[in-house]
């Protein structure tokens, strides 16, 4: 602890100029004071001034008022500093002396004589308020006041608490009257050394070095550091933890940059045609009647559907067509005949049957021919009977469907599961795709069927084809091929045609 006992001398009265021994001072009592401060004693005794002592210069002669003086000799109030915890009790001895010698340092003069002394014993709490008192004896009177205050930076009832305001990285605070810390705005903690971060800053993913700040830890972003940063290069994907790249619907590949749903994202097929996805950026448009072109953007001639019968010739008109009928036929589509069986109207061996009492006829066509006059050869593929991309082929009187891999049945309507025979080795996961099964291999294996064990730097052998980029370290003991546009497969070995709905991990 550290404090100061302060004694303010106010007035001393010695009207007769007498000493304690009854003698008078000639020409008057040139008065100075000795003060002794010590621990509390019920009976004041001689001995060391344990709390301190001080002497004044000559302050006046006989009777005088003592003025306050803040510096130099004759300082008033008198200061008795101490470097211990103030006990709350004390004994004080104030002696008035006459000196015939030096005004400034009377202590050192020989022949000094005691005028009077007073002794005060009691309790005194630390505080700013002065305690005033007056002591009389038969010859003199002394008016004075005193108090105990703490030294700078010391606080509390006994001046025992040290506190120094500071504003650096070991604390940002001021001191309360009791010596406790009062944090500056924006700071917290026992020593006010912890900044209060921006409100809402994520506790784990963000921090701050000064108030109202939110600095993100690696892998996090956003004003409050509550948004993860996806894998570098992630195009159409999101993350729930840092460096993830979970693809949005319709996107695939390591960086979610392969468009698996070109139809939905770009709507390339026009005029009400049907769009079918066929791998990254791949699609086909199935046109409605009357349209053609890669995107069904071209309108067909109104005559394209061959509406004119019986050999009539078709002429396009605005929003319509017109049939020019051959001799013997009439009607909008030349469907009415003026011919009879006598005119031999049936071609390709068709049999003529008279109708309406010979005023018209009907042809019964042999196999593979059709039309009102058996003039058309039958095309059994016009109805698009083959499903799942199967190719229709005319075979004489019948037709057959040539199915794409993975499909079977008369109309290619049945899907074959290539994964049923478990083609993937070493615990690889099988995926049924249009062009056959594809295996996703566990760590440490590669190959189309996961049959190759990896024992070295997976990318060293250059396993990726068609200019693909090889990555290792994305998971233990494996590599990943990031395919260029137009190729898929674990090594980017397949041209577009099957959608990679999962990352290709070899």
């Amino acid at each position: 602890g550290s404090g100061i006992f302060q004694l303010r001398l106010q007035e001393f009265v010695n009207q007769r100029g007498m000493l304690a021994n009854g003698q008078s001072c000639e020409p008057g009592c040139r008065t100075f004071f000795r003060i002794c401060l010590k621990h509390f004693q019920a009976t004041f005794s001689e001995g060391p001034c344990t709390f301190g002592n001080v002497s004044t210069p000559v302050l006046g002669t006989n009777s005088f008022v003592v003025r306050d003086k803040n510096s130099g000799s004759g300082r008033n109030p008198l200061q008795l500093p101490f470097n211990f915890t103030w006990p709350g009790t004390f004994s004080l001895n104030i002696q008035a002396w006459h000196t015939p010698g030096d005004d400034l340092r009377p202590e050192t003069s020989p022949g000094n004589s005691l005028i009077s002394q007073i002794i005060i014993q009691g309790s005194l709490a630390v505080g700013k308020i002065w305690r005033t008192d007056e002591q009389n004896d038969t010859l003199t009177r002394l008016s004075y006041s005193y108090r105990v205050i703490c030294s700078d930076n010391y606080y509390g009832e006994s001046c025992s608490r040290l506190c120094k305001k500071r504003d650096d990285h070991f604390g940002h605070y001021e001191c309360q009257p009791d010596g406790s810390l009062s944090c500056l705005p924006g700071w917290t903690g026992k020593y006010c050394d912890q900044p209060i971060c921006l409100s809402g800053c994520h506790e784990q993913n963000g921090y701050c070095s000064k108030p109202d700040e939110c600095i993100c830890r690696p892998g996090w972003q956003g004003r409050l550091c509550n948004e993860c940063i996806p894998h570098n290069g992630c195009r159409h994907g999101t993350c729930s933890i840092p460096w993830q790249c979970a693809c949005d619907e319709g996107w695939g590949g390591l960086f979610c940059d392969q468009d698996l749903n070109y139809c939905t994202h770009h709507s390339p097929c026009k005029n009400g045609s049907t769009c079918s996805n066929s791998g990254p950026k791949g699609y086909t448009c199935t046109c409605l009647p009357g349209y053609t072109g890669e995107h069904c953007e071209l309108g067909l001639s109104k005559c394209a559907s061959n509406p004119c019968r019986n050999g009539g010739s078709c002429k396009d008109q605005e929003n319509s067509y017109h049939c020019l009928c051959p001799p013997g036929y009439y009607g909008q589509h030349c469907e009415h005949s003026t011919l009879t069986c006598a005119d031999s109207p049936c071609f390709n061996g068709g049999s003529c049957r008279e109708r309406n009492q010979g005023s018209s006829y009907a042809c019964e066509c042999p196999p593979n021919f059709t039309g009102s006059n058996c003039e058309k050869k039958v095309d059994r593929c016009t109805s698009n009977p083959c499903a799942n991309g199967g190719q229709c082929q005319n075979r004489g009187p019948s037709r057959t469907c040539r199915c794409r891999p993975g499909f079977t049945g008369t109309h290619c309507e049945l899907h074959i599961s290539d994964c049923a025979r478990s083609p993937c080795a070493h615990g690889g996961t099988c995926h049924d795709l249009e062009n056959g099964p594809v295996c996703t291999c566990p760590a440490g294996f590669s190959g189309r069927r996961c049959e190759v064990r990896i024992t070295h730097d997976a990318c060293a052998s250059g396993p990726c084809f068609n200019g693909a980029t090889c990555y290792t370290g994305l998971s233990p003991n494996n590599f990943v091929c990031n395919c260029p546009y137009g190729f898929v497969g674990s090594r980017c070995e397949f041209p577009v045609g099957l959608p990679p709905s999962f990352p290709w991990v070899a």
Partner: antibody
């Protein structure tokens, strides 16, 4: 009890970068109660504070060295490091790492044993 | 920049009191630490926050700080106390060491 151990090359060529690492054992460098400092002492001379850092990476440097000093922390390894660039013979000193306690008003209650770094060609 | 000044040396007889001063502008308003360093050894903290002794430091070491001067006092000095002593304070965000005082026990 916490122990600090400096490591790094004892000889550095002029104009190069001095790099030292302090490994903390027996306590976590991630405590908010401490800053981790570097102090140096040229042969036969007094102590000079270089700078310090806390677990979050907040750094404070001696203004006279600030342009050349970088202090960093690696909480996963319980280490902090000093880099001093463009060194000259005047940077020859024993380099100490120390723990500065917030509760002690910034007093350094634990020190490494020090490592002598000589700058010479 | 802020500076702390110490006397280069102080001599004391065994059993006597050694006082080492450390002066700096407004030093009384800053917390002062004192370090003891023996030859070939790392510094050891003997006083922090002006007058507090860390555990393990003998009671003969005490400190005070007011005005522009901080003082480290070694009462009943022993031969083992012969060492260099450094005061240290924080000026804003910067640590500042005194120039050091060599204490010789005669």
């Amino acid at each position: 009890e916490v122990q600090l151990q400096e490591s790094g090359p004892g000889l550095v060529k002029p104009s190069e970068t001095l790099s030292l690492t302090c490994t903390v054992s027996g306590g976590s460098i991630s405590s908010s109660n401490y800053y981790w400092g570097w102090i140096r002492q040229p042969p036969g001379k007094g102590l000079e504070w270089i700078g310090d850092i806390n677990y979050n990476g907040n750094t404070y440097y001696n203004p006279s060295l600030k342009s050349r000093v970088t202090i960093s922390v690696d909480t996963s390894k319980n280490q902090f490091s000093l880099k001093l660039s463009s060194v000259t013979a005047a940077d020859t000193a024993v380099y100490y790492c120390a723990r500065e306690a917030v509760a002690l008003g910034g007093g350094a209650d634990d020190w490494g044993q020090g490592t002598l770094v000589t700058v010479s060609s | 920049s802020y500076e702390l000044t110490q006397p280069p040396s102080v001599s004391v007889s065994p059993g006597q009191t050694a006082s080492i001063t450390c002066s700096g502008e407004g030093l009384g308003d800053k917390y002062v630490s004192w370090y003891q360093q023996k030859p070939g050894q790392s510094p050891v903290l003997v006083i922090y926050e002006d007058s507090t002794r860390p555990s393990g430091i003998p009671e003969r070491f005490s400190g005070s700080n007011s005005g522009d001067t901080a003082t480290l006092t070694i009462s009943g000095t022993q031969p083992m106390d012969e060492a260099d002593y450094y005061c240290q304070a924080w000026d804003s965000e910067t640590g500042v060491f005194g120039s050091g005082t060599k204490v010789t026990v005669l």
